[in-house]
Structure formats: C-alpha cells, structure tokens
C-alpha cells in the first residue's frame, strides 16, 4: 500500500523533474475545477457565549494560556454579519465556501440532545444563503472547538468515549444539514489537535509532554472519522449521495544531501511522522506505518486485524492541508535534521505515490502576513501564485488528480496560538471597529481574477 | 563498542528497598532510539522485565511491580538506576540492566545486556 | 505463568534441525516485533534474532526466525554442543505497556 513516497527524493526518472521551462506554467485548471475558500468557526465567529452557545476548550485556553487576548469576542463577527460574509463570498466568485459548525453552539455541552436554536438557525441560514447563490458548502463537523464540557467531564479525545459521542454529533448534522451539504469533513488535521493539544501544550486544551496521552488522542481521532464514514456511508449517502472525508494537514522537507539514502530515509520518515500517521489508517493499509510501530512501540495504541478492516478505505477524497500551522513550530522529531521545504508540488507527489493517486481537495493553503498589513498584501499575493502554480504543475504535469483548492482564509481572524499577530484573511477585517467591515485585500482581488480565468493567462 | 555494568549492594534486608546503578559505555542514556531497561530472573526461573525508561524521562514497569519500581537516568554520569521499595525474599534473582532499541527501520528488542549482579533478600 | 508460552524443553541430536514455538495474543506477537535471546549456562542473555527474522552481526545463519499472526518461531539447523542453552522468545504488549518474555525453553542437544 504504502513507501513509494520516497522516489520524490530520490528523483525517480517517472518524476517529472521541475526545469527551467516549468519554474511557472502558463495554463488553465481543468473544466470545472473546484475553486473555494475556507473559515473556521472559532477563528471567525466571535459571539462566544452568545445565544446560549456552551464554551469550547479554545474558549477556556483563551482566557488561561492567552493572557493578552481577552477572547474571541472580538475575531470577525461572522455569527453576527453573516451577511457580510455572503458578500464577500460574492464578491470572490467562488465555486464553494468550506467553513466549520461550532459544536458547542449546536451542543452547549457536546451531548446530542435538544439543539441549541439559535444555533441551529444560524447554520441553517448560512446553508441556504450558500445553495441560493450556487456555493457548494463543504462543512467540517470539528475544527478544534470541542465543548469544554466534554473535557472536563471525559479528558476530551484522551478517552474513547468521545467517539461515540462525536458520532451522536455527526448524525445530527447529517440530518439537519445534509439536504444542503454534498461535501463533509470530519475533521479538521488531527495531527495538530494532538500534536499541539496534548504533545507541546501550544494549542487547546495545553497539555503536555505526554507522548502516550499524544497517540492516544490521534488513535481516537482515528476511530472517530472512521465511526462518522461508516455512519455516512451507511444512513445517508444512500439518499444524500454526498462525499466524505478527513482535512490531513503536513508540512514539506528536503534532504540535507540529495543523494544521500540516509537523508532520503529521514525524509520518509519525517512525512510518515505527521502525515502518514493518520492518512495510513485511513487512505493506506488501515494500521500505522510500520516505521512508527516499530520506533513509537511503547506509546503508539495499536489496531485489531477488525479495526484495520474498518479504518481502511473511509475517505471518499483526500483532502489535504498544506500551510503555516504545519511549519511553525515544527516539531523536532518531524524534521529530523533535514529541510523544511514549502514545495507543495512535492507533497502532492508524494501523497499520489504513498496512497495510490487518490483525488484530492486541497482543503487549507495560503500563507500569513503580519496584523499591521491591511489591504496590500503582496507577500500573500506572491505565496499564492506560488503555491497555484504548484498545483497547476501537479496537475498538467505530473498528473495528479487534484480537483478543488481551498484559499485560506476568507477572512482575518483569530490564529491559534498566534492570536491576532498575523492575519490570513483575503478580506480584511479591523478588530477594534464596531461593523466589522470585510475590505478586500490585493489577495482578494487577485484570486478573483484566478478563478475568473481558471489559472493563469499569458 | 557498548557495554553496561551493574553495581549495587548483594545483601538486602527484607522491607528494605533494593537499589542498584548500571553504569553506560559506548553510548550516551540521553540517545532517542534507547529505553534503559531492568530485568531479573530468580534462581532457576525465566526472565521477568522490571522496567524501563526513555531519554525524555518516561517510563514503563511491568504492572504487577509498579507500585515499588523507580527507574531513573543520570545523564551527567551516564547512569541509570532502579530501586526496588519493601523487598521480600521473593525479590531475590539476579539483576541485569538492558538497552532495550527500536528505531524506524528495525526493533531490536534487548540488544545489549550486562553481565547481572545478584542480589539476595535475606535478615 | 508467562504471557508468552514456550515449550518447557527440546532436544536432538547434533546436525539436526530444531525449533521452538512461542505463541502470545494480538495484543503483544500479533501487532508487536519478536526477539529471541540465548542464554548460555551461567551467562547473561543474548540477541540471537530482532524485529521477527533478522540475525545481529556475528551470529551465524544456521538461526533463524519466523512469525506468523500471534506465533513466531526460532529454529536452528545444523546443530551444534555449543547450542545447548536456554531460549527465551521477547516483544512488546500493548495491553500491559510491558515487555513481556516467553518461559523459557532448554535445548538439548543429545
């Protein structure tokens, strides 16, 4: 199933090599290419606890870890200026909109119960604004905002209970939405969730330093999406005929020498390490890669002969995260003394390789600019022509079967551990005004203009 | 090449705590691809894992032991060490400690083992 | 009582073939790696076979070992005085967090 990845390094003559009449190609995307942009909810929707909506662990890691952010009250506001957003969506030309539904505004507590209406009412809104305007939503059920509650009470995806929990939530969702929604993510790059969340401390809920407690949390990530595909495929693509999949985020590298093995076997392992972790089970063979069975064998859960069975094969696509939050900081272990690379191209060979060409939705990538920048974004402009003219490459060239983009973001907002230092926005957005206007960067104007022309014009 | 070397006392009174240091050549405790390891065999008997411990300060013990293992690294004198709380008689065996290995590519498994000291819990 | 079972003993003659089973679960041979380690009289252990089948520098081919789903296999052809040992087969168990090791088996060469 899996190790071809490794012939990207070694410049396996199948490999188109990038010369110097394909440092930037002239050309259009395929016929309809699924061009989108992408919010999450915590990122963009401020009103924290407004309208009954229950705090989620980011919520509480804000106000104990983020000592100068004093909440996302502030953030963008979507949860208020919907409209707003619809606007720039319009104004964008996008084929669909990837955005997140906050569980605790459904679920204040995270337990399937009686939705909060509010709620309800806003993501239903949202859904049908997007199937008016001929946006096709692509919704992801967890993008990190996990009702405190269910942390308190459980320790969060640390204990399998949740799995079964998040399904309840999933369920819920496929019926509510699921007449609108053809395109599904369960979640959004697990690696980051417990790489950050449970390893280095740096995102929700902060703990750290256990590596057991890190695996664990990836293996019930794991079993979680398997749990919502199965749960799909079974109750509701039948009548939905929709897609589902996992958003698995990486980073890049390169050999300190490139053509030394022992560096080209690092640089295997460091993408096993992050990004064949989850896609293994998932898009491969149904287990861990053997490389980190054998060297994580005392922290790493394993799978039963059943649960490979079940893990295999539940993602309808692959969709694929490459930007900042997989580069800064990377972890030691991941790098493993060779360089980091931002050649998305690359990666996009490697994952045709490693999983057996599977069709992928780049469903985050972009770049971030400093909070002081407002609308004259040109490092972004630069990071996205560069980042597009790696995937046209992939597709033309190597023939890789990438069908749809995700620009990140829409819309400044919250970043993470980053707080509002930087901004990933196409739209602009002053915090500390009261209307929350969306300005549209030069990104904005130029990303228009990509999807108006299908790529790049001579 | 690597070698280890256990020390400690051979006489141990019962409900005392057994405590014993191996002491590292040929490679350095604080290495990622190594778990620092103990493990005894009583007169006559198989061998039975204690415990071991990883460079970054984790640890595992074999579970019907934990409650009287402790398993630490001394980077500054490349040591380890394993202490052994409220012994009795069936604690008597002798005492090897281990590099324990895996790394991406193959799992050694105990690689490398001392010579063993043997310790006797008697008044 | 071992989490690995071992036959207690095996015999034969010089020159003849030999194995010995160890047979575990899924949680420990079926989803882990298996050494195998020599134990002469009156000596420490030692590494005769890693990651199921694979042999360290100096030690000669005539050992070899297997696994299949929650059993693995050492066996030794061609054998020699100098075998006569004790053979303990070793992985990780996933359920106990623990190195577990089989209970041993004598070899007798006859």
């Known amino acids: 199933f899996s190790g071809d990845g490794r012939a990207i390094w070694s410049k396996n003559p199948n490999f188109t090599p990038v010369n110097e009449s394909q440092l930037f190609l002239y050309d259009t995307f395929p016929k309809n290419f699924f061009w989108g942009i992408g919010t999450g909810a915590l990122q963009v929707e401020g009103s924290w606890k407004k309208d009954g909506k229950g705090p989620s662990i980011w919520d509480h890691f804000i106000h104990t870890h983020l000592k100068n952010v004093s909440s996302t009250n502030g953030s963008s506001d979507s949860y208020i200026f919907l409209e707003k957003d619809l606007s720039a969506l319009d104004f964008i030309g996008v084929s669909f909109y990837q955005f997140s539904i906050s569980w605790p505004r459904l679920f204040p507590d995270g337990i399937v119960t009686v939705a909060n209406a509010k709620g309800l009412q806003y993501y239903s809104t949202l859904l049908d604004a997007l199937v008016l305007r001929n946006i096709e939503p692509i919704v992801t059920l967890y993008h990190w905002d996990l009702p405190l509650a269910l942390q308190e009470k459980y320790g969060g995806w640390k204990n399998d209970t949740i799995i079964d929990i998040f399904n309840d939530y999933a369920t819920y969702c496929f019926q509510m939405f699921g007449d609108r929604v053809k395109y599904w993510i369960t979640i959004h790059n697990p690696y980051l969730v417990a790489w950050h969340g449970y390893g280095t401390g740096m995102h929700a809920p902060g703990e750290k330093g256990n590596l057991a407690a890190v695996y664990t949390v990836g293996h019930n990530l794991i079993k979680a999406h398997s749990k919502v595909w199965h749960n799909y495929n079974t109750h509701f693509r039948p009548h939905q005929k929709g897609w589902l999949s996992i958003t698995l985020g990486s980073h890049w590298i390169e050999p300190n020498r490139s053509e030394n093995t022992m560096d080209i076997f690092k640089c295997q392992q460091s993408m096993v390490s992050v990004l064949g972790w989850f896609a293994n089970p998932i898009h491969g063979d149904g287990d861990y890669p053997e490389g980190m069975r054998k060297k994580l064998f005392s922290v790493l859960p394993i799978f039963s002969e059943a649960e490979k069975h079940e893990m295999r094969g539940t993602a309808d696509f692959f969709a694929f995260s490459f930007g900042p939050n997989n580069f800064k900081p990377l972890n030691t272990m991941a790098k493993m003394g060779q360089n980091v690379s931002l050649n998305l191209r690359e990666a996009l060979n490697w994952i045709k390789l490693e999983y057996n060409n599977p069709r992928i939705l780049i469903a985050e990538n972009g770049w971030f600019t400093d909070s002081r920048v407002k609308t004259e974004d040109t490092t972004a402009i630069y990071m996205m022509k560069n980042f597009l003219s790696q995937v046209l490459q992939a597709i033309r060239l190597d023939e890789i079967r990438v069908f749809g983009y995700t620009a990140w973001s829409l819309l400044d907002g919250f970043e993470w551990q980053d707080a509002y230092t930087i901004r990933r926005g196409l739209f602009y957005v002053d915090f500390n005004s009261k209307q929350k206007e969306r300005k549209p960067k030069s990104s904005a104007h130029y990303y228009k203009q990509i999807i108006r022309e299908n790529g790049f014009s001579l | 090449q690597v070698q280890l070397q256990e020390s400690g006392p051979g006489l141990v009174k019962p409900s005392e705590t057994l405590s014993l240091t191996c002491t590292v050549s040929g490679d350095s405790v604080s290495s990622g691809d190594n778990y620092w390891s103990w493990i005894r065999q009583p007169p006559g008997k198989g061998l039975e894992w204690i415990g071991f411990?990883?460079?970054?300060?984790?640890?595992n013990y074999n579970p019907s032991l934990k409650s009287r293992v402790t398993i630490s690294l001394h980077t500054s004198k490349n040591q380890f060490s394993l202490r052994l709380s409220s012994v009795t008689a069936a604690d008597t065996a002798v005492y090897y400690c281990?590099?324990?290995?895996?790394?991406?590519?193959?799992?050694?498994?105990?690689?490398?083992w001392g010579q063993g000291t043997t310790v006797t819990v008697s008044s | 009582q071992s989490v690995l079972t071992q036959p207690p003993s095996v015999s034969a003659a010089p020159g003849q073939k030999v194995t010995i089973s160890c047979s575990g679960s899924s949680s420990n041979i079926g989803n882990n790696y298996v050494s195998w380690y020599q134990q002469l009289p009156g000596t420490a252990p030692k590494l005769l076979i890693y990651?199921?089948?694979k042999r360290p520098s100096g030690i000669p081919d005539r050992f070899s070992g297997s696994k299949s789903g929650t059993s693995a296999t050492l066996g030794i052809t061609g054998l020699q005085t100098e075998d006569e040992a004790d053979y303990y087969c070793g992985t990780w168990d996933s359920s106990l967090s623990a190195v577990v090791f089989g209970g041993g088996t004598k070899l007798t060469v006859l």
């Open positions: 411990m990883f460079y970054s300060g984790s640890t």
């Open positions: 281990g590099r324990y290995r895996s790394d991406w590519d193959y799992y050694y498994g105990m690689d490398v």
């Open positions: 990651d199921n089948n």
